[in-house]
């Protein structure tokens, strides 16, 4: 949606820095948009020698870089912080690194959780 009416989406939420930033640590985030604005889900993480460290997940504001992406796929070669965004409820639950320059595709599966809705 996002064409004429306000959009509502739900995304997986996570903030590794939740204590300092005084937010929830994890759960579900309900994103309620303004008229004619799209909303996306995103994930960001670090990869230290093959160990994945989740940084943040949640709702992402209207961003053409995220349009019509069904899956959360990071394409940068070797960033300090990986980022992907997508459209679709909970599309940020799993995320992938597939560098544009080629190389192995790495998909990260989330551990099973019972998330709570953030208010």
């Amino acid at each position: 949606s996002g064409r004429g009416e306000a959009e509502t989406r739900e995304c997986i939420y996570y903030n590794a820095n939740w204590e300092l930033e005084r937010t929830n640590q994890s759960g579900l985030e309900r994103c309620e948009g303004e008229q004619d604005k799209r909303l996306h889900c995103y994930a960001s993480w670090r990869n230290s020698s093959g160990t994945i460290e989740l940084v943040k997940k949640g709702c992402w504001l209207d961003d053409f870089n995220c349009y019509d992406r069904q899956e959360c796929v990071a394409t940068e070669e070797n960033p300090q912080v990986y980022f992907c965004c997508c459209e679709g409820n909970f599309c940020n639950e799993r995320f992938t690194h597939l560098p544009e320059a080629g190389g192995p595709e790495v998909t990260y599966e989330p551990p099973p959780t019972a998330p709570t809705l953030l208010t």
Partner: antibody, heavy 120, light 107 residues
Framework: QVQLVQSGAEVKKPGASVKVSCKAS????????MAWVRQAPGQGLEWMGI????????SYAQKFQGRVTMTRDTSTSTVYMELSSLRSEDTAVYYC?????????????WGQGTTVTVSS | DIQMTQSPSSVSASVGDRVTITCRAS??????LAWYQQKPGKAPKLLIY???SLQSGVPSRFSGSGSGTDFTLTISSLQPEDFATYYC?????????FGGGTKVEIK
């Protein structure tokens, strides 16, 4: 239209406290967070902290920890920033700014600013 | 804290010129970067968020690019109302921090 209206200019003595208000209108008050940013004369912008009006939680820059208190009154859609133990270096224009609840949290609407002068 | 370094600190340009301002973060901030314009005696105004997304109502001559640590704000054809100071700001982690500002002056 969306608007943030701040309280008027203040002149304070060193050691005193100042409380600046920021009244929001034109949007759902609890659907956005509010940041405070200050600017000393001729200087750049400095982020002081953020308050989440939906729950009242706050996060302050370490530099201001212990001296700053941000509060909100949902009945009047107003946020407050109180700075204590004022010194001359606190002379600045203080801005409130509306912050999206969603990443990457831009500050999309700003108040007109409140000039605080600290002088003996 | 994440340091944000802007360059140049000032630039002299003429109406119609293309102006480019750069901002470098001391560590990776992905796309958590915004650009603001400030005119003397006025509050800052949001131009760009998420490194490259244009805020509603901002003219399309403003554009942003970059990710990670290096970012750019470009004004494709400078207009008289664009003479101001521009700041970058990261919102990746608290405390949020600003660059030192770039003053765009009339040549």
């Amino acid at each position: 239209q969306v608007q943030l209206v701040q309280s008027g200019a203040e002149v304070k003595k060193p050691g005193a406290s100042v409380k600046v208000s920021c009244k929001a209108s034109g949007y759902t008050f609890t659907s956005y967070n509010m940041a405070w940013v200050r600017q000393a004369p001729g200087q750049g912008l400095e982020w002081m902290g953020i308050i989440r009006p939906s729950v009242g939680s706050t996060s302050y820059a370490q530099k201001f920890q212990g001296r700053v208190t941000m509060t909100r009154d949902t009945s009047t859609s107003t946020v407050y920033m109180e700075l204590s133990s004022l010194r001359s270096e606190d002379t600045a224009v203080y801005y409130c700014a509306r912050v999206s609840m969603y990443a990457p949290e831009p500050m999309d609407v700003w108040g007109q600013g409140t000039t605080v002068t600290v002088s003996s | 804290d994440i340091q944000m370094t802007q360059s140049p600190s000032s630039v002299s340009a003429s109406v119609g010129d293309r102006v480019t301002i750069t901002c470098r973060a001391s560590q990776g901030i992905s796309r958590w970067l915004a650009w603001y314009q400030q005119k003397p005696g006025k509050a800052p105004k949001l131009l760009i968020y998420a490194a490259s997304s244009l805020q509603s109502g901002v003219p399309s001559r403003f554009s942003g690019s970059g990710s990670g640590t290096d970012f750019t704000l470009t004004i494709s054809s400078l207009q008289p109302e664009d003479f101001a100071t521009y700041y970058c700001q990261q919102a990746f982690s608290h405390p949020w921090t600003f660059g030192g500002g770039t003053k765009v002056e009339i040549k």
